[in-house]
């Protein structure tokens, strides 16, 4: 992890490295390893991908051990195979502006993502897609027996599904935060980012958390209950404690993880928080990350790998998450 | 972003007519029903009316026979006329949305008074 | 007249849980009376907390529920925090009118 002791390389020459990835030399100057790409974690000895401008970012002085791979200022986005500048806003479908931001895509819908609770007028209200409209519309379902115009007489119990606003006014300055985009890795540890102008100066910000969505070794098939197809919140039976690049975290944690389905649907966080975990390393020292908890989960068919890239990490993406 | 906004006079005399608008934005009035309630100087809320998002209108039968309530939806705006008025009907008035009363207006405050 | 009654006032401490109740003159409150809580915080505007009995509005914070107890409608604070000193008013559905209760005012103590 760091360059205090000797050179040791893996045995076999060189790793093959994905198409687009660079090999090269790790930061104490000893091994040929496969650089990190946007997002990713990053190390003295794991550097970033230098011919895609990336650099180390550490967050903090303090923390001089894990960082995420962050490109340079002014480094443009490559979205939808598109390229865009830095400071670049787009429109990736009619229903997202998107913002490219030294690398970093942020994106804001332009539908309204307005909740609307049981009324005696609108006692089952649904948002549907409308014929020949990009957003979707509350629609409320009558109950059988209403033809008057005022209100139906019924209760319903509509699921909170619908997050804050994340626009605001504030002192001559649009706040504007971005959706936290979905977590990097389906399972382990990964990373979660958003664009924000929420600071006293209203400039755009990258903010970085880790995250993960379930442990990689847990087979969860194995606990779907016969008949059923997914599971979407497995229970986690033991406190753990988080692994990051063989640092530990200080505390355990019972946290929750999303299931998996046999169907092909997927199971995604839907609500979140954001809080800071210390991770204690081998050397002593002492470093604090910002990280993703699960409060509930999702299963749906809008997987990582659908069509509209956005679409399918906006629908994927965390709800409710004020942190 | 849902905004409501009340307008009206500040004063009006007794035995007049009260007409206040508010003036949605963020939303359709023909998706979303408007009530109107007022808060008397350090009292409760009171309910006085809603339009519904189809135009069905309800009242409170208190005031029933003094209240009218519409909409023009183009404009996104509703209305609430109070014939009548009384010294008690000061209170500040209000307009909030339907479903769960989630969004209201700053409230707009009437006095009566000769 | 119906009249929806709640507590004048109530006092919890910072952690503590506290629930508020909406009782109705002519019976039990049931589903059907759509029950609504709205909040008002000094110098704010009032906002929905909840609707549709249990129903939380996107700002509603976790830590408020809304349920039927005892054939009331009741908003439970668990985890009360020094924020939420604020009025609280409920108003129920009967048919073709709402009624407002008299609103309980939370008190948060330290």
């Known amino acids: 992890q760091n360059c205090s002791g000797p050179c040791r390389c893996p045995a076999e020459q060189a790793p093959r490295c994905p198409a687009g990835v660079s090999l090269v030399l790790d930061g104490c100057g000893c091994c040929r390893v496969c650089a990190k790409q946007l997002g990713e974690l990053c190390t003295e000895r794991d550097p970033c991908d230098p011919h895609k401008g990336l650099f180390c970012d550490f967050g903090s002085p303090a923390n001089r051990k894990i960082g995420v791979c962050t490109a340079k200022d002014g480094a443009p986005c490559i979205f939808g195979g598109t390229v865009y500048r830095s400071g670049e806003s787009f429109q990736s479908s009619c229903k997202y502006q998107c913002t490219c931001l030294d690398g970093a895509v942020g994106c804001m819908p332009l539908c309204s993502m307005d909740v609307r609770l049981p009324s005696p007028d609108c006692p089952f209200p649904r948002r549907v897609k409308l014929p020949g409209k990009c957003c979707e519309e509350w629609v409320c379902d009558e109950p059988k027996d209403q033809t008057v115009v005022g209100p139906a007489l019924a209760a319903y119990r509509l699921e909170d599904t619908f997050g804050p606003d994340p626009t605001m006014i504030r002192a001559n300055c649009l706040v504007q935060t971005t959706e936290w985009s979905a977590c990097s890795k389906t399972c382990g540890m990964g990373i979660s980012t958003r664009v924000t102008n929420d600071n006293a100066s209203c400039r755009l910000e990258k903010q970085s958390r880790l995250c993960m969505v379930r442990p990689c070794e847990a087979d969860l098939e194995e606990n779907i209950k016969k008949g059923k197809k997914c599971i979407r919140t497995p229970k986690i039976s033991k406190p753990i404690k988080f692994e990051l690049s063989g640092c530990t975290s200080v505390k355990t944690y019972r946290a929750k993880f999303c299931g998996v389905c046999t169907d092909g649907r997927c199971c995604t966080p839907h609500r979140t928080t954001t809080l800071p975990v210390e991770f204690k390393c081998p050397d002593g020292e002492v470093m604090k990350k910002n990280m993703m908890f699960i409060k509930t989960c999702a299963c749906h068919y809008n997987c990582p790998g659908d069509n509209d890239i956005f679409e399918s990490l906006y629908y994927r993406k965390m709800y409710g998450d004020m942190a | 972003e849902v905004t409501l906004k009340e307008s009206g006079p500040v004063l009006v005399k007794p035995t007049e007519t009260l007409t206040l608008t508010c003036t949605v934005s963020g939303f359709s009035l023909s998706t979303f029903g408007v009530h109107w309630i007022r808060q008397p100087p350090g009292k409760a809320l009171e309910w006085l009316a809603v339009i519904w998002r189809r135009g069905g209108t309800d009242y409170n039968a208190a005031f029933m026979s003094r209240l009218t309530i519409s909409k023009d939806t183009s404009k996104s705006q509703v209305v609430l006329t109070m014939t009548n008025m009384d010294p008690v009907d000061t209170a500040t008035y209000y307009c909030?949305?339907?479903?769960?009363?989630?969004?209201w207006g700053q409230g707009t405050t009437v006095t009566v008074s000769s | 007249e119906t009249v929806v009654t709640q507590e004048p006032s109530l006092t919890v401490s910072p952690g503590g849980t506290v629930t508020l109740t909406c009782r109705s003159s002519i019976g039990a409150v049931t589903t059907s009376n759509y029950a609504n809580w709205v909040q008002q915080k000094p110098g704010q505007a009032f906002r929905g907390l909840i609707g549709?009995?249990?129903n939380r509005a996107p700002w509603t914070p976790a830590r408020f529920s809304g349920s039927l107890l005892g054939g009331k409608a009741a908003l439970t604070l668990s985890g009360v925090q020094p924020e939420d000193e604020a009025e609280y008013y409920c108003?129920?559905?009967?048919?073709?009118?709402?009624?407002f209760g008299g609103g309980t005012k939370l008190t948060v103590l330290g």
């Open positions: 549709g009995t249990s």
């Open positions: 108003a129920l559905w009967y048919s073709t009118h709402y009624v």
């Open positions: 909030a949305r339907d479903g769960g009363f989630d969004y």
